[in-house]
């Protein structure tokens, strides 16, 4: 079937392909291509007030190609879609829209967030952290001897960084005060990180519980566990002047 059905024709070239431009099989001076050579897609191009038929090897942006027995034609994607496989499946949305399940949305559905790089609706990703690593040896100024009170630290890794709407990561570093059997440093022992050194259990008045530093949490979304720690900290400051303090890093 030729694509110009119902259109006024000035003159059809007598020879089907002679005088036709590019991939046209048949054409007219007024309407341009009327039908295309095999495998080429027929599209209408607006030039001023009139539409001209053109034959293309692939359809332009905003259109997709469909093959019928009588014509291969370019069909418009939905208005909010830039590139599509067909009317049901958009593969790239126009500016200001987010792609979700092949559709273009101006807002992402509940439980999803907009990724402004890919312009897609994606699952919200919450932070995931590993288990705490063991506490480091008790040290003071980098030494494991020649003191009674020192500090020990433990860390955990971020397994999964959160997305924009995801829960922030809890602290990944904790430091607490610790005590060791006072011992003079032997020659060559200065600064030795004595991993094998045994630590004494804390004295009754001392707590080995680590409390995140409230300052480092102020700028982050608090998770319930952190809020509880803040309250505990205030309470215990009154109870025990020798309270152990934690330095936290919030990601």
């Amino acid at each position: 079937q030729n694509a110009s059905r119902g259109r006024r024709q000035r003159r059809m070239h007598p020879n089907v392909s002679q005088g036709c431009q590019g991939g046209c099989a048949t054409c007219s001076d007024y309407n341009g291509c009327l039908s295309c050579k095999p495998r080429l897609f027929f599209a209408l191009e607006r030039i001023g007030m009139k539409q001209i038929g053109v034959c293309l090897s692939s359809c332009p942006s905003g259109y997709y190609g469909t093959r019928y027995p009588d014509i291969n034609k370019c069909t418009k994607c939905k208005a909010d879609c830039d590139t599509c496989f067909n009317k049901n499946f958009c593969t790239k949305c126009k500016s200001g829209f987010y792609l979700h399940l092949g559709k273009c949305l101006d807002n992402c559905p509940e439980g999803l967030e907009a990724n402004n790089h890919t312009m897609e609706c994606v699952s919200i990703v919450h932070c995931e952290v590993s288990e705490w690593n063991p506490w480091s040896p008790c040290t003071k100024k980098g030494k494991t001897c020649g003191f009674k009170r020192g500090t020990e630290t433990r860390v955990r890794e971020i397994i999964q960084h959160p997305s924009a709407k995801g829960n922030l990561c809890p602290p990944t570093n904790e430091t607490r005060k610790c005590t060791v059997q006072r011992k003079k440093c032997q020659k060559g022992e200065r600064g030795k990180k004595g991993r094998e050194r045994k630590r004494k259990k804390p004295n009754k008045g001392e707590s080995k519980e680590a409390i995140p530093d409230s300052k480092s949490l102020e700028s982050s979304k608090e998770i319930p566990e952190q809020r509880e720690n803040k309250q505990q900290q205030k309470k215990r400051k009154v109870q025990d002047k020798q309270k152990s303090v934690s330095v936290s890093t919030v990601h």
Partner: antibody
Amino acid sequence: EVQLVESGGGLVQPGRSLKLSCAASGFTFSDYDMAWVRQAPKKGLEWVATIIYDGSRTYYRDSVKGRFTISRANAKSTLYLQMDSLRSEDTATYYCATHDKTFDYWGQGVMVTVSS
Amino acid sequence: DIQMTQSPASLSASLGETVTIECRASEDIYSDLAWYQQKPGNSPQLLIYDVNSLIHGVPSRFSGSGSGTQFSLKINNLQSEDVASYFCQQYDNYPNTFGAGTKLELK
């Protein structure tokens, strides 16, 4: 949610006629090319006919040309398949589907049995 | 008409296994190939279009490959819900034609 619901199937004698209907909802029916696809018992899928979105062009598989007529009523969001001169080899489950290169949405199917 | 030859006609595999279904076109269909899944008693459902583009919601253990006349569907880490018949379809030319199907069962 896209829904396609076929009706009109049944047992019919060879040479007789049957008309299938497919009621569409959940999408703009008048924007879509629609098709009928059939599946003989325990067999594969076979495209039968397609009608373009505005009803102006129709296409058929060779074995049903001249016997089957696909039509649509966009105002009613309904697709039809008029089947005349039925043969035993037309026995199958008939599905209506959106046809846009692929068959993206399918109805649940309706059984047509042609037997004396 | 373009003939689509699918193999095997049926196959039996164990949970967790990887299975591959082949589809051959009688002439070049470029990348105009789709795969459908039909679970027992249900209508077919589009899984993959343009050889390897997964429909949203289809698990990533499904993948498609090939071009021209040779195509395949691969299912990694087979799950019980994958028990179904699988059909390839070409849409490069009218009439659009399907493969005869591959029935996938669990061992």
